[in-house]
Interface confidence: low
């Protein structure tokens, strides 16, 4: 999916008002320095591409993020403010429903959500130069 035509300001507002708090809640109990950021993004469409991938695509050691509060809100924000996004996700969501068994918070998931926090922060500061 091409995120170029999303309403970035509306998505940013949704992140600041609610998604960010859900990410903090998920990460509660971990130190902010515990994980190194290994994923980055260069502009807002790129950031949303990475955010969507890390949030909804199961990875080795972490297959359980899609039903978390922050993921549900991320999905809603993308579906509302990215034209045509929801249609592209129908098949992927159905496949995920079949695969998912139970919710387990692993260290790998915590690391993944830490990466997500970094991507969202970058999404909110699109004019900053890359380090």
């Amino acid at each position: 999916y091409d995120f170029t035509n999303c309403d970035f300001e509306k998505i940013k507002a949704a992140y600041l008002s609610t998604i960010s708090k859900d990410l903090i809640t998920y990460m509660s109990g971990t130190k902010s320095t515990e994980f190194n950021n290994t994923v980055s993004c260069s502009n807002r469409p790129h950031c949303l591409t990475e955010i969507q991938s890390l949030t909804f695509n199961p990875t080795a050691g972490c297959a359980s993020l899609a039903k978390e509060m922050f993921a549900m809100k991320t999905k809603a924000a993308l579906a509302i403010w990215c034209p045509g996004y929801s249609e592209t996700q129908i098949n992927a969501t159905q496949a995920m429903k079949k695969r998912r068994k139970r919710k387990v918070t692993t260290n790998k998931c915590l690391e993944q959500v830490s990466q997500l926090q970094g991507l969202w922060r970058r999404f909110n500061r699109p004019l900053l130069k890359q380090q």
Epitope: M72, I80, E87
Partner: antibody, heavy 118, light 108 residues
Framework: QVQLQESGPGLVKPSQTLSLTCTVS????????VSWVRQPPGKGLEWLGV???????NYHSALISRLTISKDNSKSTVYLQMNSLRAEDTAVYYC????????????WGQGTLVTVSS | EIVLTQSPGTLSLSPGERATLSCSAS???????LHWYQQKPGQSPRLLIY???NLASGVPDRFSGSGSGTDFTLTISRLEPEDFAVYYC?????????FGQGTKLEIK
């Protein structure tokens, strides 16, 4: 079973602050959201805002500067405060429970009529 | 903001007839976020259909919902006297909540 009950002053003067209470039973506010919806006499439904289980809130963009939703989990009570009231805020105010994390309101209170008049 | 427009504003039909109520979104939305409510005078709204086509608990199967993208429909296959009420469509996503202006279904 799930129940919601609104209570409030009934009559409020213009420019004053409205304080409403929604007392819930049959579920816990620690892991469920509660939303406020209003309906002016003879008109349609207007969503005002929501407070989620974790305490995070979302507000109607046109009312965000006038509206505060809070809660006391231990008292199973959700509060709505709206300041700078005007005549057009006259409405029946409902609290409603979203089904999980969604905008699906499966349970509603009976509503409380608030009249803004001097 | 996404705006939901319902049509017609008022629908006059007789018991036994078929009712078709429309809800149009100003931009495309996921079918997961479109819901319908029924409201009778002096009563709270009642959830009728959620996620476009799923009947809420206790709702008779003469009610059905369909649609995708920007156009959604609530159909009552055979009107009963108790079906005459106001119907609202709603965009409810957990981030955004918007109601249509309502369609009044009245007895002809």
């Amino acid at each position: 079973q799930v129940q919601l009950q609104e209570s409030g002053p009934g009559l409020v003067k213009p420019s004053q602050t409205l304080s409403l209470t929604c007392t819930v039973s049959g579920f816990s506010l620690t892991n469920s959201g509660v939303s406020w919806v209003r309906q002016p006499p003879g008109k349609g439904l207007e969503w005002l805002g929501v407070i989620w289980g974790d305490g995070s809130t979302n507000y109607h963009s046109a009312l965000i500067s006038r509206l505060t939703i809070s809660k006391d989990n231990s008292k199973s009570t959700v509060y709505l405060q709206m300041n700078s009231l005007r005549a057009e805020d006259t409405a029946v105010y409902y609290c409603a429970k979203p089904d999980g994390y969604s905008g699906i309101f499966a349970y509603w209170g009976q509503g409380t009529l608030v009249t803004v008049s001097s | 903001e996404i705006v939901l427009t319902q049509s017609p504003g008022t629908l006059s039909l007789s018991p036994g007839e078929r009712a078709t109520l429309s809800c149009s979104a100003s931009s495309s939305i996921s079918s997961n976020y479109l819901h319908w409510y029924q409201q009778k005078p002096g009563q709270s709204p009642r959830l009728l259909i959620y996620r476009t086509s799923n009947l809420a608990s206790g709702v008779p199967d003469r009610f059905s919902g369909s649609g995708s993208g920007t156009d959604f429909t609530l159909t009552i296959s055979r009107l009963e006297p108790e079906d005459f009420a106001v119907y609202y469509c709603q965009l409810g996503s957990g981030i955004l909540f918007t109601f249509g202006q309502g369609t009044k279904l009245e007895i002809k």
